[in-house]
Amino acid sequence: GSERTCCPVNWVEHERSCYWFSRSGKAWADADNYCRLEDAHLVVVTSWEEQKFVQHHIGPVNTWMGLHDQNGPWKWVDGTDYETGFKNWRPEQPDDWYGHGLGGGEDCAHFTDDGRWNDDVCQRPYRWVCETELDKASQEPPLL
């Protein structure tokens, strides 16, 4: 399977997950595929603590996360429940804005310059963050 006991080179370990931060931009789907080929997924933010960690690393730059509503309801790419989970939207977001003139609404979520979330056109070339969880078994203390 895909279990890991330590983070790959150039990834950052934090709270039993590994994170990789791009330095360039891709459309949301291309960023998603990049992460999947690396046995990871676009970052799923489950707490305020994780939000602050990611925000610290990305700085004030629009950055894709693993949250979208391309098929209707908002969904996290790893199956984490959206409705009951952590959220950090900007005021009046998400708004599925159609006024950008690019066709359709806004179906992909990103961190904005202040870290809060916005929905935007999935084709925009934003930076992205991949995340992969470390082997859950390795959290158990060794048997004596």
């Epitope: 330095r23 291309d30 080929l37 690396e38 046995d39």
Partner: antibody, heavy 121, light 107 residues
Framework: EVQVLESGGGLVQPGGSLRLSCAAS????????MSWVRQAPGKGLEWVSA????????FYADSVKGRFTISRDNSKNTLYLQMNSLRAEDTAVYYC??????????????WGQGTLVTVSS | DIQMTQSPSSVSASVGDRVTITCRAS??????LAWYQQKPGKAPKLLIY???SLQSGVPSRFSGSGSGTDFTLTISSLQPEDFATYYC?????????FGPGTKVEIK
Amino acid sequence: EVQVLESGGGLVQPGGSLRLSCAASGSTFSSDAMSWVRQAPGKGLEWVSAISGSGDNTFYADSVKGRFTISRDNSKNTLYLQMNSLRAEDTAVYYCAKVYSAYDSHWFDPWGQGTLVTVSS
Amino acid sequence: DIQMTQSPSSVSASVGDRVTITCRASQGISSWLAWYQQKPGKAPKLLIYAASSLQSGVPSRFSGSGSGTDFTLTISSLQPEDFATYYCQQANSFPWTFGPGTKVEIK
């Protein structure tokens, strides 16, 4: 450094099946994404499929989707391409390549020497 | 799918010549472009990735440039071992696609 060597090519009738193998040397195989690229005789290169290091995530060109299956056995350091419902247009040299991650994207390096698949009656 | 085109399809040159090959993508691919060299009967070899980064072990006479849709591979002083076919490839999005190739022949 990973080195790769393909095998399993040969002559097969249209509608038939074939499984290609790619043996890799190098201690990082289980964490390396891998890919298949093909080249029809006298033609250019065509990406076929890719797979993540664990084998959990796979990607296919539309031309082979539903007919070809990429897989890997990390305990044997081996990559596979199961080819079903073969057509004349699948005739090509099939190359195995490591997917090299750098500068926020993926590149093919190194490549194997290729194995020839001929689909003909 | 992103279509890749190359020009010229073939070029005749002499040892010591400067050779330039161009590659164009049907839509913007930022700097996600690679160049490969293939000799007859051999596997392709990665020369340049991320549009301008020279792969380890590749001679410095090879260089790449460009961004967006237009890219260039330059061989500053052609050597006998450089006669081959050169392919560009976009690594921006699936399906990864290659250009049709440019054959560099001896004049």
